[in-house]
């Protein structure tokens, strides 16, 4: 509009300002290292810090480091964010017994409950699991290793393995200390309760399926063991993991004995289109960061799409010209970055681990 | 913990509009961006359109032209005004904060808010 021109050439001519054409306003320019929290700021008031990745802003302000979920007894609960930590919890099958801010200091495996005893609440991540006195008729399970044996019929007791508790069992007294195997082991000890059936009525040819052994005396140890690469789902099943050799993706977390590996797109990229664990279509994110070197104030209310790079590689953020246009070239499509075969069976089922890469292989 | 609640959702015939809104709750809603993914019965969850703090957007190429982003920090909501309507639009629509950090894996749909179901019939 002509009638903006003075204004324009004006507020163009404060270094600490910028003129935004979308709104035809003058605005400002936050400081370098601080990011706009709306559209045309007015003063400093409304620019704030830009943290370092796996940090966020607390509420006083600082940068402040997310907790760390890497412990093998741990889990992300809830990602690290612009604003607040990540939050972690026990895996599953263990649940927390010295709680602290967003995390837990020890993890304990769920308990089982002994012969005679049933579940009345099962674990969770935060609490053991409690045990009752079976109601008369039921057997106990277990107690011996007859009573231990593949059901004949397609009947399921129980239909999915539940932890269980008292503190008569050394679970309780029992902290993760080594790495995944030990994880691994100690779980298969204490993960199915009595009176479940060793392999949920499936024969022990399954893929994925180590030959599983009667319990041994007086125990619970009727959990069936997958082959490495295949966990135990829900129903039971030995179900393959997720595979993340695909180059735009990184593993977020281990395949484990009761639940697959999850994989996510690598640093840089979005995930656009979903699958089971993992992500079908990874594409470079597509909206520059503030401290690129862009100038994003300029770009106010332009479509920042982008022309697909490499795989691995950022969108072009290279400064846009003084008038606030976008460069001609920018004109992309996030269908078109990766190959568009990726996705079209999708959802993709957790037993059959994509493998597709970006580069056709 | 973060809390998104969309709403605006409903059943529309083709060619018709619908504004949604995603407000949030526990959290200030000026962090660097947000998204909105949708997911259709039986199918993946996917990207539908990003904006930043500063206003810049982004759109998937199937809603370019027909469904704007906009951003309300000082009610803590983003809206998508979604036109012309077509059928293969119909899904669950669900915003998602700060998606550079907290969408790289398959889990954008459904994991800060129950998301608003649009439904268009021909």
């Known amino acids: 509009f002509p009638q903006d021109r003075p204004f324009e050439d004006t507020c163009r001519g404060n270094p600490g300002h910028y003129y935004d054409k979308a709104v035809r306003r003058c605005c400002y320019r936050c400081p370098t290292g601080l990011f706009p929290t709306q559209q045309c700021p007015q003063r400093p008031a409304d620019c704030r810090k830009q943290c370092e990745p796996d940090y966020y802003l607390d509420e006083a302000g600082r940068c402040t480091a997310c907790v760390s979920c890497s412990r093998d007894d741990l889990v992300e609960k809830m990602p690290c964010a612009w604003n607040s930590s990540r939050v972690c919890e026990c895996q599953p099958g263990m649940f927390c017994a010295v709680s602290v801010v967003n995390s837990c200091a020890r993890c304990f495996f769920h308990s089982v409950c002994p012969a005679g005893m049933i579940v009345k609440f099962p674990g969770t991540a935060q609490k053991n699991t409690v045990c009752e006195p079976a109601s008369p008729g039921v057997s106990p399970a277990c107690a011996s290793p007859e009573n231990c044996k593949e059901p004949s019929s397609g009947t399921i007791p129980q239909a999915k393995p539940t932890p269980v508790s008292p503190a008569t069992s050394n679970a309780s007294t029992m902290p993760l200390r080594g790495g995944t195997r030990l994880a691994q082991e100690a779980a298969s000890k204490l993960t199915r309760a009595p009176g479940s059936p060793s392999s949920v009525g499936r024969p022990s040819s399954d893929p994925g399926l180590s030959p599983t052994q009667p319990c041994p005396q007086g125990s619970g140890d009727c959990r069936k063991q997958c082959e490495p690469d295949y966990y135990l789902d829900e129903a039971g099943r030995c179900t393959a993991c997720v595979s993340c050799s695909r180059d735009d993706l990184v593993e977020k977390t281990p395949c484990a004995w009761n639940s697959s590996r999850i994989c996510e797109c690598r640093p840089g990229m979005i995930c656009a289109t979903s699958a089971t664990n993992s992500c079908a279509r990874c594409v470079p994110y597509p909206i520059c960061a503030a401290e690129t070197g862009t100038k994003p104030q300029d770009m106010a209310e332009k479509d920042t799409t982008f022309e697909a790079p490499p795989v691995g590689t950022q969108p072009d953020c290279s400064p846009t010209p003084e008038n606030g246009e976008a460069p001609a070239s920018t004109s992309p499509t996030l269908s078109s970055l990766v190959d568009s075969q990726a996705s079209k069976t999708l959802p993709i089922p957790t037993s059959a681990p994509i493998a597709l890469s970006s580069t056709g292989k | 913990e973060v809390q998104l609640v969309e709403s605006g959702g409903g059943s529309v015939q083709a060619g018709g509009s619908l504004r949604l809104s995603c407000t949030a709750s526990?959290?200030?809603?000026?962090?660097?961006?947000m998204a909105w993914y949708r997911q259709a019965p039986g199918n993946a969850c996917e990207l539908v359109s990003i904006?930043?703090?500063?206003?810049?957007?982004y759109y998937t190429d199937s809603v370019k032209g027909r469904f704007t982003i906009s951003r309300d920090n000082a009610k803590n909501t983003v809206f998508l005004y979604l036109n012309s309507l077509q059928p293969e639009d119909t899904a669950v629509y669900y915003c998602?904060?700060?998606?550079?950090?907290?969408?790289?894996?398959?889990?954008?749909?459904?994991?800060w808010g129950p998301g608003t179901q649009v439904t268009v019939s021909s």
């Open positions: 904006i930043s703090a500063d206003g810049r957007t």
């Open positions: 526990r959290f200030t809603f000026d962090g660097p961006d």
């Open positions: 998602a904060p700060d998606p550079r950090r907290n969408c790289r894996g398959g889990y954008c749909c459904g994991n």
